[in-house]
């Protein structure tokens, strides 16, 4: 029970990575991250 980051994202699909607190769905090509997701395996806000 440490503070170290989990080695993998336990999310459905292959498009999630640890961004900040949670595993988030990344942004599509050509878009940039405005804000990370606010729940496990959530969607990032992209622009």
């Amino acid at each position: 029970q440490g503070g170290t980051r989990s080695p993998r994202c336990d999310c459905a699909g292959d498009f999630h990575k640890k961004i900040g607190l949670f595993c988030c769905r990344g942004c599509p090509a050509g878009h940039y991250l405005k804000a990370p997701c606010t729940e496990p395996c959530g969607n990032s806000t992209c622009l």
Epitope: G2, G3, T4, R5, S6, C9, G20, L21, E39, P40
Partner: antibody, heavy 123, light 111 residues
Amino acid sequence: EVQLVESGGGLVKPGGSLKLSCAASGFTFSSYAMSWVRQSPDKRLEWVAEISSGDTYTYYPDTVTGRFTISRDNAKKTLYLEMSGLRSEDTAMYYCARDREAYYGQQYVMDYWGQGTSVTVSS
Amino acid sequence: DIVLTQSPASLAVSLGLSVTISCRASESIEYSGTSFLQWYQQKPGQPPRLLIYGSSTVESGVPARFSGSGSGTDFSLNIHPVEEDDSAMYFCQQSRRLPWTFGGGTKLEIK
């Protein structure tokens, strides 16, 4: 032994600013996300800010967004909360808390809390 | 935001008996088989202390008299048998989704 010691509270006028500090010891500070939680005089608890372990991402509820800024200095093992545009409803005891990851690093539990620093906003 | 409603707001229980405090969420706080629900104890002049996380996992160092249960939207904290030292405020808290939110608290008095 994990220790969190807050400081910087006090009496401030509405519209004023204050910067709180939280000195951490007894654990690898840089490996943990950290939060600020406040407790109003009526004893209600409200989470007001969080910062990821890597110092990259910050999170706030709507009630303080744009007025409060959380930051950390991992070298100094210190957490900060900069508060501006203070209102009477910001009057509270402010606690810093360590966030321990659980369940694939996607659940966070506030497992250690400091003793708190009191903030009073009044004219 | 996820709203947590605790009941009762206060109660008095005789020493040695059992007590149950309830916490209801405005929406499910379950994810992937885990309930993202914590219970904290707070005594006067002290910060909150983590008792239980994940609805039912007792934190290290917490007496076995404390137990948690529930899933979805309905959760409870049970203390059995109640001791004098258990006189305190108890809060539930969700970490399913930001912003983290807390219940309004339950004040437990020992008779």
